[in-house]
Interface confidence: medium
């Protein structure tokens, strides 16, 4: 039975060229984590978190995806077309396949705010 | 930090039996697949059986098939490959390996890697 | 049975140079490869999984790529330390194999 929740930073904000912290946090299980994994909108993998085999970043990422904090992906130098769905997917020993879904907006003001707040969506 | 540690190798002669040990520790046993590699005297290395976590299932490579056993005993965190009707050509160094699992998320299937190995016990048979 | 045919047997170069290393299976394997590193005396040492992706530790001059049927590793610039034989490996199915290896010997 998955008696687990996926916690968000939900919908969050920033401005274009910034960066932001997508995190996700997976709690009320004891299931071992074997491995996150992190999409875009278009379903498209950014980079994959292995509890044993480490970081792996798409090369089509490389140079603006960061891994962490923790289980977390860093995006930087945020273009207009980094705006929309992002999700974690957690893999994991014995529930399954946990997923987890965060909205971005890249704003051209500069005086757009980072909201980093959880919610459970 | 992972161990795994090899035992019950020498010499024996061709007919005969022996069973190999491995000791686990630095991680959860019950939860990961286990392997034999074996490698024989200045050659490469060649898959032997596997076993998953939980003892369910077990694989063996066709030149093994029928002479040898993998088994584990999960309680006492050891994996144990039991080898039969032993030939000549069983000389080798055998190695243990844990698995790593990782999650294919385009073929929607998991791959399992060895990437923990013990050092590797020497079995000898010969007349 | 899939095969795994490493080429060249041997390679020999000196350090600071580009290695490349090519393995070949019998039928599409999609991505489920791995390269090993193996010195003498010592047990294997997973370097490459997926194909492509290093093992947690592995130094950025390691990289591996290829799908289906033809695969490489890449040495950018060989270490003294990375002197030894390297074997690939499928793990699409049953049963499991190896190439048989390529030594990386200094010239």
């Known amino acids: 039975m998955m008696t687990g929740t996926i916690e968000t930073t939900g919908n969050i904000s920033a401005k274009k060229g910034g960066s932001v912290i997508l995190q996700c946090h997976l709690s009320s299980t004891m299931a071992q984590v074997t491995q996150v994994n992190w999409e875009q909108h278009d379903h498209s993998l950014l980079a994959i978190r292995n509890a044993e085999l480490g970081w792996h970043i798409y090369p089509a990422f490389k140079d603006r995806v960061a891994p962490g904090p923790g289980l977390g992906l860093t995006l930087q130098s945020l273009t207009m077309n980094d705006t929309g769905e992002y999700f974690c997917t957690y893999h994991t020993y014995p529930d399954g396949t946990y997923r987890g879904r965060i909205f971005l907006e890249v704003l051209e003001s500069s005086v757009a705010e980072h909201s980093a707040r959880f919610q459970i969506p | 930090e992972v161990q795994l540690v090899e035992s019950g190798g020498g010499v024996v002669q061709p007919g005969r039996s022996l069973r190999l040990s491995c000791a686990a520790s630095?991680?959860?046993?019950?939860?990961?697949?286990m392997v034999w590699v074996r490698q024989a005297p200045g050659k490469g290395l060649e898959w032997v059986a596997s076993?998953?976590?939980?003892?369910?299932?077990?694989y063996y490579a066709d030149s093994v098939k029928g002479r040898f056993t993998v088994s584990r005993d999960n309680s006492k965190n050891t994996l144990y490959l039991q080898m039969n009707s032993l030939r000549a050509e069983d000389t080798a160094v055998y190695y243990c390996?844990?698995?790593?699992?990782?999650?294919?998320?385009?073929?929607?299937?998991?791959?399992?890697?060895?990437?923990?190995w013990g050092q590797g016990t020497l079995v000898t048979v010969s007349s | 049975e899939i095969v795994l045919t490493q080429s060249p047997a041997t390679l020999s170069l000196s350090p600071g140079e580009r290695a490349t290393l090519s393995c070949r299976a019998s039928?599409?394997?999609?991505?489920?490869l791995a390269w090993y590193q193996q010195k003498p005396g010592q047990a294997p040492r997973l370097l490459i999984y997926?194909?492509?992706k290093r093992a947690t530790g592995i130094p950025a001059r390691f990289s591996g790529s290829g799908s289906g049927t033809d695969f490489t590793l890449t040495i950018s610039s060989l270490e003294p330390e990375d002197f030894a034989v390297y074997y690939c490996?499928?793990?699409?199915?049953?049963?499991?194999?190896f190439g048989g290896g390529t030594k990386v010997e200094i010239k």
């Open positions: 390996a844990r698995v790593s699992y990782y999650y294919d998320s385009v073929e929607l299937r998991w791959a399992e890697y060895f990437q923990h």
């Open positions: 630095g991680f959860t046993f019950e939860s990961y697949g």
């Open positions: 076993i998953l976590y939980d003892g369910s299932n077990r």
């Open positions: 039928q599409s394997v999609s991505s489920y």
């Open positions: 997926d194909a492509s």
């Open positions: 490996q499928q793990v699409h199915n049953f049963p499991l194999t």
